[in-house]
């Protein structure tokens, strides 16, 4: 039950981008695929009211008339549990300069719902995607990205925030999920595993991929992230799976080659602007979409997730660099930073293409379980 391999004409990143559809039956999850805790690693750095931003924080995505002290992505407080994790994995996020903040961590106590009640919500992320159960929705048009090809200057902030590596994006990166569903990109970050252990957040028919990229967007209907949190469609995340391929991905290398500089938790560097769209699959027309949540506290719901069907290819060395370079909290390796998949609880994952037909010989026609969520927007 795997989708047919896609023959891509113009591979991303100098020939090492995603040619493959993210399905495979030979790689079903083992017990080691994710940490045993209910809420293993994951990260979406978002702002909270008690944490006013410093100069170094993400540029505002807001009208020019907005007051100066407004909140920015990355400013939400996070919560850390005492004690050490049972497994050698990432736990707390502790900036060297900001020990006065509260923090969350992966594994152990307290459970995330105690950190943020929304983490016990019914519509959480990530989820396991089963293409043959996805509802084909013709109304889901190809994604539109505008302004993602950034010039080298101004440079962008690349930061090891203790639970991921995050690239802060400048104003002007516009994304449309469809007519009237417009967003501005705020930041991107990655999730990964460890040696021999995949670390994507979403899974496909139980298959966990080596890594996953998230590009986080704020709806143009909101001036600030804190206003959008928990509001349906207030935030949107584009997600793509990263897989091992034979060649180096030149787009990703522009970031991965700089990880050594930010190995220490809380450290950051400036990197030249790059083509952000080159970090994503080239096929913007085939994707899965559902409404979920942030994958870490505060776990706010109402987030529109768009998961590309096509994967992005990185070399084995690049994936190794990603999982093996950074230090996280508690003086441990920054690894396995993904959350366990969460129950759908009746949600239907939509597909922009007839995924059920391609992925299963038993499926005779596209599954049309309900009307498209996107229809009529």
């Amino acid at each position: 039950q795997r989708l047919p391999r896609m023959q891509e004409d113009s591979p991303l990143g100098g020939g090492s981008s995603g040619e493959d559809d993210p399905l495979g039956e030979e790689d079903l999850p083992s017990e080691e695929d994710s940490p045993r805790e209910e809420d293993p690693p994951g990260e979406e750095d978002l702002p909270g009211e008690e944490d006013l931003p410093g100069e170094e924080d993400l540029p505002e995505v807001k009208p020019k008339s907005e007051e100066e002290g407004s909140l920015k992505l990355e400013d939400l407080p996070t919560v850390e549990a005492p004690g050490d994790p049972q497994e050698p994995q990432n736990n707390a996020h502790r900036d060297k300069e900001g020990d006065d903040q509260s923090h969350w961590r992966y594994g152990g106590d307290p459970p995330w719902p105690r950190v943020s009640p929304a983490c016990a919500g019914r519509f959480q992320s990530p989820v396991d995607i089963r293409p043959q159960l996805a509802a084909f929705c013709p109304a889901l048009r190809p994604l539109e990205l505008l302004g993602f090809q950034l010039p080298p200057l101004p440079e962008l902030r690349l930061r090891n925030n203790g639970h991921s590596v995050q690239l802060t994006l400048p104003p002007g990166l516009e994304m449309a999920l469809g007519p009237g569903r417009e967003y501005r990109a705020l930041q991107l970050h990655l999730h990964w595993g460890a040696a021999g252990r995949p670390g994507s957040e979403h899974t496909v028919e139980g298959h966990r991929f080596p890594a996953e990229i998230h590009v986080v967007h704020l709806s143009t209907a909101f001036a600030r992230v804190d206003e959008a949190l928990g509001r349906p469609g207030g935030l949107a995340v584009l997600a793509a799976f990263l897989e091992e391929g034979p060649e180096e991905n030149s787009a990703y290398e522009q970031l991965l080659s700089r990880l050594e500089e930010i190995a220490e938790e809380g450290s950051e560097t400036q990197v030249p602007g790059l083509d952000i769209s080159a970090l994503l699959p080239s096929d913007f027309s085939r994707y899965f979409q559902y409404e979920g949540s942030l994958t870490t506290p505060p776990c706010a719901q109402g987030v529109i997730w768009t998961v590309f069907n096509q994967t992005v290819m990185l070399s084995a060395k690049q994936l190794h660099t990603l999982s093996d370079t950074l230090w996280g909290p508690g003086d441990s390796r920054l690894q396995l930073n993904f959350r366990a998949t969460q129950p759908l609880n009746g949600r239907v994952i939509e597909a922009s293409f007839p995924a059920g037909v391609d992925s299963s010989p038993r499926a005779a026609e596209p599954v049309q379980l309900n009307s498209c969520l996107a229809a009529g927007d």
């Epitope: 050490d84 040696a195 050594e260 220490e264 003086d331 441990s332």
Partner: antibody, heavy 118, light 107 residues
């Protein structure tokens, strides 16, 4: 090939500051982590700390309050300062280069002996 | 801090012998363990990194294995130049720690 050479006074008085410099030759100091390790006579190895060429540091907690590391990329050098020394700081001090990922030390200086005595 | 222990602390062996040195971590360190050889009056030399990867130029008689908390360095046929002290070092924690060393001398 890259070579490392430690230099500094071989004798330091108690309560004073030990200062050592490691000079990197045969290659650039840039884009690497560099480390200091010490070894008291007849004893094992103790990691002191590391520094990246950007100046980012990480120190052994047992020495953190007394250690300062710095880097001078223009001179291809990095240095160690250890304040308020006592006789327990008498050791052979090594500088070494770290391999990112495994974080093993693949190139070492020959070591310099520092004695703390009045 | 992660504590590292080695056993034995010393051993006597003959040329040609198979020698096994064990290193144990106080908590799981995955495969983040490096092995060094140090001869008297010399700096340590990296032999094996991440538990089992032989560094270039190191003879193939040296091998490493293990993961989690228990690791082994094996010298399959001891040579005269192998008489030295061997140290393990963990790099799972960013606060690196070494084992106390195992001295291999001539029987």
């Amino acid at each position: 090939q890259v070579q490392l050479q430690e230099s500094g006074p071989g004798l330091v008085k108690p309560s004073e500051t030990l200062s050592l410099t490691c000079t990197v030759s045969g290659g650039s100091i840039s884009s690497y982590y560099w480390s200091w390790i010490r070894q008291p006579a007849g004893k094992g190895l103790e990691w002191i700390g590391r520094i990246y060429t950007s100046g980012s540091t990480n120190y052994n907690p047992s020495l953190k309050s007394r250690v300062t590391m710095s880097v001078d990329t223009s001179k291809n050098q990095f240095s160690l300062k250890l304040s308020s020394v006592t006789a327990a700081d008498t050791a052979v001090y090594y500088c070494a280069r770290l391999i990112t990922g495994p974080y093993g030390m693949d190139v070492w200086g020959q070591g310099t002996t520092v004695t703390v005595s009045s | 801090d992660i504590q590292m222990t080695q056993s034995p602390s010393s051993l006597s062996a003959s040329v040609g012998d198979r020698v096994t040195i064990t290193c144990r971590a106080s908590q799981s360190i995955s495969s983040y363990l490096n092995w060094y050889q140090q001869k008297p009056g010399k700096a340590p030399k990296l032999l094996i990194y991440t538990a089992s990867n032989l560094r270039g130029g190191v003879p193939s008689r040296f091998s490493g294995s293990g993961s989690g908390t228990d690791f082994t360095l094996t010298i399959s046929g001891l040579q005269p130049e192998d008489f030295a002290t061997y140290y393990c070092q963990q790099s799972y924690s960013s606060l690196f720690t070494f084992g106390p060393g195992t001295k291999v001398d001539i029987k």
